[in-house]
């Protein structure tokens, strides 16, 4: 895909990182078995994947979380894949929702999001969750990536 | 993607197969509506997809299982996508976890894993689960595949 | 991917649409942040993605639904990705199943399906669910797409 100097491969896969920040935006790191094909895609501030070239991208995220119905709010756990483009409104690209488990102390569940979207130069994608403290950061459980078609 | 003789398409999609083996590694078959683009990717011993060319691959697996909280161990059902490369450490690429259902006799749930990874020539990927006897093998429920970027 | 006039990119991502129809086939629309690369892939009758060119495609669907164990049938909620090719039998490519939640009035859950399949010219793919009335149509919750390798 995208062979040659004119058309290099563009792909990224980053790994979740626990964060003391109270923000709902998940944090990521280039660690473990990560992928960062070249500088045409970058991880910025540990929170968003930013692309330099316009085009169609398959973007995905996986979030594993552990929650309990009694200890959580009534609302389900929601993971959102969001887009921020220069000079445009932020928007939700994809969302997934899972009702909290009745298992104690908490029940693990995994969410997978993925889709094809047009990104502009300088566009960034990031992942929001309703409660970051419930996210599982064990090897392989929570990750985020993209590939340019 | 990978057009021409120099750059053939490389892709595979294989279908789950019930197994009497006690191993936690899932078994697969080239049956039903499967995909095997050419001999640059092969299904070995019915358990792993092995690639001949180095490069970035999008690798995915879907596992549907049926389990019951009372009849299962306390630990959740976990599906792991694992990598084995000649002369390198085996490692977990992706994992997903789902707590067992309280439905009787068992409750079905589906897990989807997917991500972009660099594979070396001769590298193999395979899928591990905590309890293979709980996996659903009905048409389309459990599958495994990859595509070279 | 598929660069140049001979080999244009082919990709689609469509958004779920609530429907008064009683059919189990989900309805989709080119609305919101949708993708339709060109006329080599089309959304027909709001229900199926149809391709003009033979080849390998990565096809995916995500379905979020809200259901309750007591109010639903015993059977789980099942989402199926199906294929219809000219002059051939329809067939199931992928399925996922989730047991209904015990949460009241209903518990949300998300399903993700995806795989690589060979499509013939004129082939159509569509998504079936056991109960369309349970599907969530909020922004980003339910979508369907493909990309040609």
């Amino acid at each position: 895909m995208q062979k040659g100097d004119q058309n290099p491969q563009i792909a990224a896969h980053v790994i979740s990182e626990a964060s003391s920040k109270t923000t709902s935006v998940l944090q990521w790191a280039e660690k473990g078995y990560y992928t960062m094909s070249n500088n045409l895609v970058t991880l910025e501030n540990g929170k968003q994947l930013t692309v330099k070239r316009q085009g169609l991208y398959y973007i995905y995220a996986q979030v594993t979380f552990c929650s309990n119905r009694e200890a959580s709010s009534q609302a389900p756990f929601i993971a959102s894949l969001c887009l921020k483009s220069p000079g445009r409104f932020e928007r939700i690209l994809l969302r997934a929702a899972n009702t909290h488990s009745s298992a104690k102390p908490c029940g693990q569940q995994s969410i997978h999001l993925g889709g094809v979207f047009e990104l502009q130069p300088g566009a960034s994608v990031f992942v929001n969750v309703t409660d970051p403290s419930q996210v599982s950061h064990g090897t392989g459980f929570t990750s985020f990536g993209l590939l340019k078609l | 993607m990978q057009k021409g003789d120099q750059n053939p398409q490389i892709a595979a999609h294989v279908i789950s197969e019930a197994s009497s083996k006690t191993t936690s590694v899932l078994q697969w078959a080239e049956k039903g509506y499967y995909t095997m683009s050419n001999n640059l990717v092969t299904l070995e011993n019915g358990k792993q997809l092995t690639v001949k060319r180095q490069g970035l691959y999008y690798i995915y697996a879907q596992v549907t299982f049926c389990s019951n909280r009372e009849a299962s161990s306390q630990a959740p059902f976990i599906a792991s996508l694992c990598l084995k490369s000649p002369g390198r450490f085996e490692r977990i690429l992706l994992r997903a976890a789902n707590t067992h259902s309280s439905a009787k006799p068992c409750g079905q749930q589906s897990i989807h894993l997917g991500g972009v990874f660099e594979l070396q020539p001769g590298a193999s990927v395979f899928v591990n689960v905590t309890d293979p006897s709980q996996v659903s093998h009905g048409t389309g429920f459990t599958s495994f595949g990859l595509l070279k970027l | 991917m598929q660069k140049g006039d001979q080999n244009p990119q082919i990709a689609a991502h469509v958004i779920s649409e609530a429907s008064s129809k009683t059919t189990s086939v989900l309805q989709w629309a080119e609305k919101g942040y949708y993708t339709m690369s060109n006329n080599l892939v089309t959304l027909e009758n709001g229900k199926q993605l149809t391709v003009k060119r033979q080849g390998l495609y990565y096809i995916y669907a995500q379905v979020t639904f809200c259901s309750n164990r007591e109010a639903s049938s015993q059977a789980p909620f099942i989402a199926s990705l199906c294929l219809k090719s000219p002059g051939r039998f329809e067939r199931i490519l992928l399925r996922a199943a989730n047991t209904h939640s015990s949460a009241k009035p209903c518990g949300q859950q998300s399903i993700h399906l995806g795989g690589v399949f060979e499509l013939q010219p004129g082939a159509s793919v569509f998504v079936n669910v056991t109960d369309p009335s349970q599907v969530s149509h909020g922004t980003g919750f339910t979508s369907f797409g493909l990309l040609k390798l």
Partner: nanobody, 122 residues
């Protein structure tokens, strides 16, 4: 310069235990993945176990799962392989290895010890 020195091998009866050590020097131990391979006479070198720097998670080959335990002591720059319920088929030269991802070359760099022989026989 990266150096890995194994110790702890020897002769043990079936069902017995051994603990292998791998003393590392010349690199930031905590930021490298550490692991063990083995090579039986006339066979290819095979993976046994690894412990990863991203949170210390361990991974085992199916053949040793439940019997072997890998661990690391960052303060001593040493990795260990505790081998229990040993079988004759565990007889091999055991090699310690380190794996570090080189961000410049975008590739894994492996370093190897000289190996220590484990013989399981009655």
């Amino acid at each position: 310069e990266v150096q890995l020195v194994e110790s702890g091998g020897g002769l043990v009866q079936p069902g017995g235990s051994l603990r292998l050590s791998c003393a590392a020097s010349g690199f930031g131990f905590g930021s490298y993945d550490m692991g063990w391979f083995r090579q039986a006479p006339g066979k290819e070198r095979e993976f046994v176990a690894a412990i990863y720097s991203d949170g210390g998670s361990a991974y085992y080959a199916d053949s040793v799962k439940g019997r072997f335990t890998i661990s690391a002591d960052n303060s001593k720059n040493t990795a260990y392989l505790q081998m229990n319920s040993l079988k004759p088929e565990d007889t091999a030269v055991y090699y310690c290895a380190s794996d570090h991802y080189d961000t410049d070359t975008k590739s894994d760099v492996y370093n190897w010890g000289q190996g220590t022989l484990v013989t399981v026989s009655s």
